[in-house]
Interface confidence: medium
């Protein structure tokens, strides 16, 4: 897998550490497939940023499917203590708020938010899942918190 050594950093809300997507398939929606077996599997939920249980039908589906909770965590998360937190002391917007939206070069498109310096608003855009820049937030609230006046 050519993505084996790549880490895709995504800025997340201030309650949680930044999300690092190791593979773009971690952003896929849980897919039980068309078959009717009842198999307990795990998938990575980009909204809760946690590995969660789902029932897999036994065929097809996608790569966001793991035999164990541990495997899911290993493939889709890596904690990092560095956070971007807007404090009362930090009155100025960080420089990255003025960067243009950048989808990056990957193709695992997921929805993110960026601060649009033209409209002075946080807006939605498609993020490819890797590279790009720090003007990239998982939640609208965090984008507003950090970059809007």
């Amino acid at each position: 897998d050519s993505e084996e050594d790549e880490e895709h950093t995504i800025i997340t809300d201030t309650e949680l550490p930044p999300l690092k997507l190791m593979h773009s398939f971690c952003a896929f929606k849980a897919d039980d497939g068309p078959c009717k077996a009842i198999m307990k599997r795990f998938f990575f939920n980009i909204f809760t940023r946690q590995c969660e249980e789902f029932i897999y039908g036994g065929c097809e589906g996608n790569q966001n499917r793991f035999e164990s909770l541990e495997e899911c965590k290993k493939m889709c998360t890596r904690d990092n203590a560095n956070r971007i937190i807007k404090t009362t002391l930090q009155q100025e917007k960080p420089d990255f708020c003025f960067l243009e939206e950048d989808p990056g070069i990957c193709r695992g498109y997921i929805t993110r938010y960026f601060y649009n310096n033209q409209t002075k608003q946080c807006e939605r855009f498609k993020y490819g899942g890797c590279l790009g820049n720090m003007n990239n937030f998982e939640t609208l609230e965090e984008c507003k918190n950090i970059c809007e006046d």
Partner: antibody
Framework: EVLLQQSGPELVKPGSSVKIPCKAS????????MDWVKQSHGKSLEWIGD????????IYNRKFKGKATLTVDKSSSTAYMELRSLTSEDTAVYYC????????????WGQGTLVTVSA | DIVMTQSHKFMSTSVGDRVSITCKAS??????VAWYQQKPGQSPKLLIY???TRHTGVPVRFTGSGSGTDYTLTIISVQAEDLALYYC?????????FGGGTKLEIK
């Protein structure tokens, strides 16, 4: 089956307000944002904004900021759009619409509510 | 805002013909383009999203293509029921924007 049910036509006076409901069924209401789209007679479609029913967070097209207010009632799985300070320019069909999971097109639309602003 | 331009307001075609409706974005929208069909008195109907992914139940005669700023909806063999307005829409970034529409008329 996903259904978005809108109310019937509204005839309102200039300067007044109107609140349009959109009742969702056939899916978990809080799992998807609800979008609103305007279509003036014989014209194209304009995205007004959307609201995340799980937390009430909304994004507006700046053209409609101050004109439209989006709200939800989770208990009845209903989204609302209030339009205020109405003028003849606001005469249009207003649709609620729901996207796919990852914000990739609108497969589900309400039937539209015609709002006519006239003295 | 991203401007979506459909240069042809009207297109005339015959049943069985192949027709292509074009749409140009004012910036690269990384294939985040949807196409809709709208008939009089009806809500728009999603045909294509991600530029080329056909929505469930859409006839195979509808195909989408394109990348960067240029996108095309092709109807391989036009049927009488395809008489309608067709809109493109970018779902790359908010505010989502639609093209002005192309009305397909059957000769």
């Amino acid at each position: 089956e996903v259904l978005l049910q809108q109310s019937g036509p509204e005839l309102v006076k200039p300067g007044s307000s109107v609140k349009i409901p959109c009742k969702a069924s056939g899916y978990t209401f809080t799992d998807y944002t609800m979008d609103w789209v305007k279509q003036s007679h014989g014209k194209s479609l304009e995205w007004i904004g959307d609201i995340n029913p799980s937390n009430g967070g909304s994004i507006y097209n700046r053209k409609f900021k101050g004109k439209a207010t989006l709200t939800v009632d989770k208990s009845s799985s209903t989204a609302y759009m209030e339009l205020r300070s109405l003028t003849s320019e606001d005469t249009a069909v207003y649709y609620c619409a729901r996207m796919h999971y990852n914000y990739d097109g609108f497969p589900y639309w309400g039937q539209g509510t015609l709002v006519t602003v006239s003295a | 805002d991203i401007v979506m331009t459909q240069s042809h307001k009207f297109m005339s075609t015959s049943v069985g013909d192949r027709v292509s409706i074009t749409c140009k974005a004012s910036q690269d929208v990384i294939t985040a383009v949807a196409w809709y069909q709208q008939k009089p008195g009806q809500s728009p109907k999603l045909l294509i999203y991600w530029a080329s992914t056909r929505h469930t139940g859409v006839p195979v005669r509808f195909t989408g293509s394109g990348s960067g700023t240029d996108y095309t909806l092709t109807i391989i063999s036009v049927q009488a029921e395809d008489l309608a307005l067709y809109y493109c829409q970018q779902h790359y970034s908010t505010p989502y924007t639609f093209g002005g529409g192309t009305k397909l008329e059957i000769k």
